[in-house]
């Protein structure tokens, strides 16, 4: 014969536990129904009647099957440095996460953030060694020789100095190298002013085909970033 299915409330067999979504009521000494997420126990069970559940009120919630007498209060509204990524409903608490450019320095058990902090910025001469995450700050490092950063940023890494045919001003940790611009002498009339052109810039070049057998003329480019290095630094 198939085993008889017990309906709540029921007295459990000695040494056995209640089934899934049931709890043991010490007062009634019976296995009783839990309330579903979004509800709470309005009336506890007795030997003859099961748990009476009721919906959570506004701004309260229960996330799990439960037999709590009152729903939990949703957390306070998100602060100005936070974004509400999950609204308060009858079944889940509000979740506040940090805005872009911020990270969570102190979080709650529910995954919400209690305290957001602005991501650190790496200044000129420093680049990002480890990017910031939702829960950790940016780590900066000094730019190694041959690399530079001329920005104050929470995302920029140290970049290599540009390669120059001829260096006008050597690069340092906070400034790219400044190159002299070279072009074939026969591409201009004698005495013509040669406008400086950045080396390997992101603009389109339309200089004529190289004439490497002729000596190039040179003109200097002014540094675009911070002031040039102190006296004593030499170019090519």
């Amino acid at each position: 014969l198939p085993a008889q299915v017990a309906f709540t409330p029921y007295a459990p067999e000695p040494g056995s536990t209640c089934r899934l979504r049931e709890y043991y009521d010490q007062t009634a000494q019976m296995c009783c129904s839990k309330c579903s997420p979004g509800q709470h126990a309005k009336v506890f069970c007795t030997k003859t009647s099961d748990t009476v559940c009721d919906s959570c009120e506004d701004s309260t919630y229960t996330q799990l099957w439960n037999w709590v007498p009152e729903c939990l209060s949703c957390g306070s509204r998100c602060s100005s440095d936070q974004v509400e990524t999950q609204a308060c409903t009858r079944e889940q608490n509000r979740i506040c996460t940090c805005r872009p450019g911020w990270y969570c320095a102190l979080s709650t058990h529910s995954g919400s953030c209690r305290q957001c902090m602005r991501l650190s910025k790496c200044g000129p001469g420093f680049g990002v060694a480890r990017p910031g995450t939702e829960t950790s700050d940016v780590v900066c490092k000094p730019c190694a020789p041959g690399t530079f950063s001329n920005t104050t940023s929470s995302t920029d890494i140290c970049r290599p100095h540009q390669i120059c045919n001829v260096v006008a001003i050597p690069g340092n940790a906070s400034m790219d190298a400044v190159c002299t611009s070279t072009s074939p002498t026969r591409s201009m009339a004698p005495g013509a002013v040669h406008l400086p052109q950045p080396v390997s810039t992101r603009s389109q070049h339309t200089q004529p085909t190289p004439e490497p057998s002729t000596a190039p003329s040179t003109s200097f480019l002014l540094p675009m970033g911070p002031s040039p290095p102190a006296e004593g630094s030499t170019g090519d």
Epitope: P160, I163, C164, V167, A177, P212
Partner: antibody
């Protein structure tokens, strides 16, 4: 006519050293960045190192940094690559190349190449 | 793996037009840096074919042309000839690396 002629390649054991040379002619050597580019057997091109025209600034690929040293002698129109602590993966044909006019990130002239074999 | 991506092979018959692509990223081609193309005939050193996206050095036939858009570039060869059978490499500057970066190369075969 621009000419670049490499020499100094050969067979060397792992951990050994080799010095490559590149003799240049036909252009104002000191006005241009010079590069070394390598090509492993049956593989593609890989930039290795560069040096500015006046030899004040050097540049290296991460794969050779600390092991290779690029230099030049403008009075002799010669480019060098000193290769130390050589590894099997350094086996390649090494080309010297001249930086382009106004933009040293392209190479308008290449040498014929010299083969470096690192093997025990 | 190369920083710039090229198809490993391409083919065409004499007289045809063939295009070879070169795809980069926001730190190289997409950053606005110029793309250069090299031709390497079997057993020889590479030779500059196209510089600064679309410029031809003297001596390079006008059958070869280059273009660039967004994060990619392409080399077009029209009126394909048997002597065009070679490896073709694209190259560009990259923000995060000291020197230029190359594509893996495309082996062009002229059929027939």
């Amino acid at each position: 006519e621009v000419q670049l002629l490499e020499s100094g390649g050969g067979l060397v054991q792992p951990g050994g050293s080799l010095r490559l040379s590149c003799a240049a002619s036909g252009f104002t050597f000191s006005s241009y960045a010079m590069h070394w580019v390598r090509q492993a057997p049956g593989k593609g091109l890989e930039w290795v190192s560069a040096i500015s025209g006046g030899a004040t600034t050097t540049y290296y690929a991460d794969s050779v940094k600390g092991r290779f040293t690029i230099s030049r002698d403008n009075s002799k129109n010669t480019l060098y690559l000193q290769m130390n602590s050589l590894r099997a993966e350094d086996t390649a044909v090494y080309y010297c190349a001249k930086g382009g006019t106004g933009d040293p990130y392209y190479f308008d002239y290449w040498g014929q190449g010299t083969l470096v074999t690192v093997s025990s | 793996q190369s920083v710039l991506t090229q198809p490993p092979s391409a083919s065409g018959t004499p007289g045809q037009r063939v295009t070879i692509s070169c795809t980069g990223s926001s730190s190289n081609i997409g950053a606005g840096y110029d793309v250069h193309w090299y031709q390497q005939l079997p057993g020889t050193a590479p030779k500059l074919l196209i510089y600064r996206n679309n410029q031809r050095p003297s001596g390079v036939p006008d059958r070869f042309s280059g273009s660039k858009s967004g994060t990619s570039a392409s080399l077009a060869i029209s009126g394909l000839r048997s002597e065009d059978e070679a490896d073709y490499y694209c190259a560009a500057r990259d923000d995060g690396l000291s020197g230029p970066v190359f594509g893996g190369g495309t082996k062009l075969t002229v059929l027939g």
